[in-house]
Amino acid sequence: GILRLQFQVLVQHPQNESNKIYVVDLSNERAMSLTIEPRPVKQSRKFVPGCFVCLESRTCSSNLTLTSGSKHKISFLCDDLTRLWMNVEKTISCTDHRYCQRKSYSLQVPSDILHLPVELHDFSWKLLVPKDRLSLVLVPAQKLQQHTHEKPCNTSFSYLVASAIPSQDLYFGSFCPGGSIKQIQVKQNISVTLRTFAPSFQQEASRQGLTVSFIPYFKEEGVFTVTPDTKSKVYLRTPNWDRGLPSLTSVSWNISVPRDQVACLTFFKERSGVVCQTGRAFMIIQEQRTRAEEIFSLDEDVLPKPSFHHHSFWVNISNCSPTSGKQLDLLFSVTLTPRTVDLT
């Protein structure tokens, strides 16, 4: 038989970036992997020139994964670097609760990664704690805004916060810098993903920065500490917005009210819409100074009319086991206005 070989030789002019060698120093990192790969594009019939990432200028492939513990030298052989993106995963875990308690870690994209000429898509931190021993608190460098339909984020990046427990479908939400959320406390394992949306992220990278600390265990799924600004309305919504707060889950908002201000708390629906299969869904609004509280049955009562709070207060929402299709989703806002008369 005759052996026929059909092959194609592709000669392409390297871009400026292809002539450079980029150093990615992950030698001081632990439990981290960085993958550079093609962005998804639907199959095209058109011939597309090659796009490769090269390690040490020798081994070239369309996908490359770098792991922590080493210093890597990479270069690119690609006609259009926008065809690539990178995704990074890093795990921060605590196995010994006595050692970890109060320990803090900075969640920041290393500068070597920021300097690569490829779009950073996601940088995910998996934060793991010993079950029922410790919880986590996230403190942003800049206060965060929760992405809502009424007030969407319009920054070049956001933090997506979700449970990292496989059996638990809990998405806390998307948060971007420039809001009123001072900290987020979560009960157990979570993933925090910094997702970028535009090239301007390179310039705005200084606005990123979260600190995670291991704190004593608490029972609520999440606690949001909110310090509203006088200038704008703060929109807040329950986790798992479209799918509904998971069964028997409890979340709280600790809302600060400055001495010279009054906070107006407004709910955006007349009724919660939840129908309980078992248990009760309720909401507690508690004044922090006097401990006076109002309790609302979310599966029966109408939601409260706009209420005015002269002191810091708590909003706690606890879910029942809802009937499928009748989930608990609540959106509310807090607006500060100057006090006209001292009512203390």
Partner: antibody
Framework: QVQLVESGGGVVQPGRSLRLSCAAS????????MHWVRQAPGKGLEWVAV????????YYADSVKGRFTISRDNPKNTLYLQMNSLRAEDTAVYYC???????????????WGQGTMVTVSS | DIQMTQSPSTLSASVGDRVTITCRAS??????LAWYQQKPGKAPKFLIY???SLESGVPSRFSGSGSGTEFTLTISSLQPDDFATYYC?????????FGGGTKVEIK
């Protein structure tokens, strides 16, 4: 081949609700942002909403904010648009469209469905 | 929101003509602009992205140019199949907007 098929349109009274579906095939649905775009009779195209490929982030046009909800079910390769408190001005052909890629500045549409007509009238 | 203004709204031309459609943005959108063609009763068809990159399978008589706020779609030699309505779309921000459309009709 790559295909999007909308369903769920019809005639509905003002103030009522309707849910549109869009079934995707021929591509990895879970890798792409999905959008709804509408076109009123004899008028131009109007973008309605987007949902990120993994369902985490959504944006809406001001004209539908608070009334419409976009969602997706990746295992079922299906996109949805829940339309509440419908108004006469929501009357249009609703197209679902898949964005070109994912990531920075790729929200233009290389695949469109055939459209489904929604008429809001008393 | 960024407004997109297309001109002219209607254009009469003959087969073989060179046709130019203009799209203006109310603020700079760099080159984040796409063009579509739509025929009556049909879904739009994607032609051009990033102001000037031609989609695979689109005839080379179509070309796009421009950056910032001013963009053009040019059909170098109009064919019978090209009589349709053309729309520009910006994707610079989170809220996407289309131009009002330009109908290319037979003179």
């Amino acid at each position: 081949q790559v295909q999007l098929v909308e369903s769920g349109g019809g005639v509905v009274q003002p103030g009522r609700s309707l849910r549109l579906s869009c079934a995707a095939s021929g591509f990895t649905f879970s890798s792409y942002g999905m959008h709804w775009v509408r076109q009123a009779p004899g008028k131009g195209l109007e973008w309605v909403a987007v949902v990120w490929y993994d369902g985490t982030i959504k944006y809406y046009a001001d004209s539908v904010k608070g009334r419409f909800t976009i969602s997706r079910d990746n295992p079922k390769n299906t996109l949805y648009l829940q339309m509440n408190s419908l108004r006469a001005e929501d009357t249009a052909v609703y197209y679902c469209a898949s964005q070109y890629s994912s990531g920075w500045h790729t929200d233009f549409f290389d695949v469109w469905g055939q459209g489904t007509m929604v008429t809001v009238s008393s | 929101d960024i407004q997109m203004t297309q001109s002219p709204s209607t254009l009469s031309a003959s087969v073989g003509d060179r046709v130019t459609i203009t799209c203006r943005a109310s603020q700079s959108i760099s080159t984040w602009l796409a063009w579509y063609q739509q025929k009556p009763g049909k879904a739009p068809k994607f032609l051009i992205y990033k102001a000037s990159s031609l989609e695979s399978g689109v005839p080379s008589r179509f070309s796009g140019s421009g950056s910032g706020t001013e963009f053009t779609l040019t059909i170098s030699s109009l064919q019978p199949d090209d009589f349709a309505t053309y729309y520009c779309q910006q994707y610079s921000g989170y809220s996407l907007t289309f131009g009002g459309g330009t109908k290319v009709e037979i003179k």
